[in-house]
């Protein structure tokens, strides 16, 4: 049993079931790729499931003497036979069972050769391979500025491979990117929110373990909204909690081709209402400024009191239009502050 594989899987050798002609039971993890070959020759061998010959195409297929299951599902459990064409001799008699508690090769399994544990789980060593190549078909991503972009390279292998990302051939960690990046190693994904023209380029995932490496490249083109209203960095300003008497900084980062004008607003209540007859919120203008593109605008609140608690809005405008994002300031009595504020994360709100 082998865990499958690269885009050129037909060029790779496959592994035969351990026992020939005897019945064998293998337990397979849900979602695990399966790849079995029938004997030493690819010719004249056909796989059958529950008496029906497997087609040569599809998610579960019998192909060139191989049994291939792209991603094991509950309905794939059952009895599989490999028969020699002509004589119809049973070459392999195999029952596949699903173990829902297994989802992939465990990281601590690192056998040197094909091996079968007492429970029937088979953990061969395997170079990295793409598990969901259909999710990688869109190579060119052309997206409007301000959108979120997600690149994926879902992979597996044994030992479990690591993933690294490159931008234009250089290691990419997003330190210099407004808003940073989000990496989810379990989902093999890179996410960039609120993309801007400087994000354009070639993004390459490099997946490797001790047995080999694979890579795949995506092209990102950011379509400028020409002209467009200001773009505000995701997650700024951030919700903040402070203790009475402390100082607070609210940050707003603006991207704008045209000269942006920034206002900091505090939402207020007038006659018991937060909104006027026109439907707009009542606000107090705290600060107005013009900044250069991509600079950080900061609202400083010194020696905060309970009256400073509430909703604050960063309003950015240019000749095209307005953008705004809001955050809440919570002010606690000193004795109530029993925790520390986490570093805010980048998010984008239109």
């Amino acid at each position: 049993l082998s865990l499958e594989a690269s885009e050129e899987m037909e060029q790779e050798p496959c592994l035969a079931p351990i026992l020939e002609q005897q019945e064998q039971v293998l337990t397979v993890a849900l979602g695990q790729p399966v790849r079995l070959c029938c004997g030493r020759t690819e010719r004249g061998r056909h796989w059958y499931k529950e008496g029906s010959r497997l087609a040569s195409a599809g998610r579960v297929r019998g192909w060139r003497g191989r049994l291939e299951i792209a991603s094991f599902l509950p309905e794939d459990a059952g009895r599989y036979l490999c028969l020699a064409r002509g004589s119809m001799t049973v070459v392999h008699n195999l029952t596949l069972l699903m173990d829902d508690s297994l989802t992939s090769i465990s990281n601590d399994e690192d056998p040197k050769t094909l091996s079968s544990s007492s429970s029937g789980h088979v953990y061969p060593q395997q170079a990295p391979y793409w598990t969901h190549p259909q999710r990688m078909e869109k190579k060119l991503h052309a997206v409007p500025a301000g959108n979120t972009v997600k690149f994926r390279c879902p992979a597996a292998g044994n030992p479990m491979p690591t993933i690294h990302w490159l931008k234009d051939g250089q290691a990419f960690h997003g330190e210099n990117r407004i808003g940073g990046i989000r990496l989810r190693h379990q989902h093999w994904s890179l996410v960039m929110e609120s993309v801007v023209p400087s994000d354009r380029g070639t993004y390459t995932c490099l997946v490797e373990n001790s047995l080999g490496s694979i890579r795949y490249s995506y092209l990102l083109d950011v379509l400028e909204r020409s002209p467009h209203r200001p773009i505000l960095q995701a997650g700024l300003p951030a919700n903040t909690t402070a203790v009475v008497g402390s100082d607070v900084e609210l940050l707003c980062k603006v991207y704008s081709d045209a000269q942006p004008h920034i206002q900091w607003l505090k939402h207020v209540v007038i006659n018991g209402s937060s909104f006027g007859a026109d439907g707009f919120p009542y606000v107090q203008v705290l600060k107005t400024t013009d900044i250069n593109s991509s600079e950080v605008e900061v609202l400083y609140l010194r020696n905060v009191s309970a009256e400073d608690a509430g909703e604050y809005t960063c309003l950015a405008g240019n000749s095209i239009g307005l953008s705004y994002q809001s955050a809440w300031l919570t002010v606690l009595p000193e004795e109530d502050l029993t925790w520390t504020t986490a570093t805010p994360e980048a998010r984008y709100t239109d």
């Epitope: 849900l30 979602g31 829902d100 508690s101 297994l102 989802t103 992939s104 465990s106 598990t131 969901h132 999710r135 869109k138 997206v143 409007p144 959108n147 979120t148 997600k150 879902p154 989000r182 990496l183 989810r184 190693h185 379990q186 989902h187 093999w188 996410v191 929110e193 994360e345 998010r347």
Partner: antibody, heavy 119, light 107 residues
Framework: QVQLLESGGGLVQPGGSLRLSCAAS????????MSWVRQAPGKGLEWVSV????????HYADSVKGRFTISRDNSKNTLYLQMNSLRAEDTAVYYC????????????WGQGTLVTVSS | DIQMTQSPSSLSASVGDRVTITCRAS??????LNWYQQKPGKAPKLLIY???NLQSGVPSRFSGSGSGTDFTLTISSLQPEDFAVYYC?????????FGQGTKVEIK
């Protein structure tokens, strides 16, 4: 079989704190990302936070960022949500949910625990 | 944030009807969309993941389609146990926003 059991909900005053727990069984806990999703009375579902299987990645909804902290103890097969500076709008049933491998679909959910924020 | 808009917000149908619920994203989300069913007092249940994949154990009368910004959940022949609220959820961006829900009621 996979089971998720939330606990720790209850009545708390505005500005107060609560810690929710989610005990998991029936699967290899550390292999899965976990999320918290909440539902205010009579309202729709709102995703709250996610944490990767090894705890290396977390993310929060804007509405709770800076106030809530997600964490996990893989040795105890338990997921946590520390909720501080609670507001009336945080009143909801809180569900923990398991993410499918290679996806962010929640294939198993707990039964939920009710958090009521009121003075 | 990526906004998810479901339509209709509610619908009335009879057993045996073909029911279609749509979900629209505010930007391209590829196929990163899931569908859930929720009955009163119960936790949601995953029906469809990644736009079109039927979750194990879910009846085949449920199907999903779409990619990019427009998605559809179809119930080919409504059964009594299908009367519930249905939610879409995107997982393209780090914040996995849900649609506002569609209530399927008995006509």
């Amino acid at each position: 079989q996979v089971q998720l059991l939330e606990s720790g909900g209850g009545l708390v005053q505005p500005g107060g704190s609560l810690r929710l727990s989610c005990a998991a069984s029936g699967f290899t806990f550390s292999d899965y990302a976990m999320s918290w999703v909440r539902q205010a009375p009579g309202k729709g579902l709102e995703w709250v936070s996610v944490i990767e299987g090894d705890g290396s990645y977390t993310h929060y909804a804007d509405s709770v960022k800076g106030r809530f902290t997600i964490s996990r103890d893989n040795s105890k097969n338990t997921l946590y949500l520390q909720m501080n500076s609670l507001r009336a709008e945080d009143t909801a049933v809180y569900y923990c949910a398991r993410e499918k491998t290679y996806s962010s679909a929640f294939d198993y959910w707990g039964q939920g625990t009710l958090v009521t924020v009121s003075s | 944030d990526i906004q998810m808009t479901q339509s209709p917000s509610s619908l009335s149908a009879s057993v045996g009807d073909r029911v279609t619920i749509t979900c629209r994203a505010s930007q391209d989300i590829s196929s990163d969309l899931n569908w859930y069913q929720q009955k009163p007092g119960k936790a949601p249940k995953l029906l469809i993941y990644d736009a079109s994949n039927l979750q194990s154990g879910v009846p085949s009368r449920f199907s999903g389609s779409g990619s990019g910004t427009d998605f559809t959940l179809t119930i080919s022949s409504l059964q009594p146990e299908d009367f519930a609220v249905y939610y879409c959820q995107q997982h393209y961006s780090p914040s996995h926003t849900f649609g506002q829900g569609t209530k399927v009621e008995i006509k």
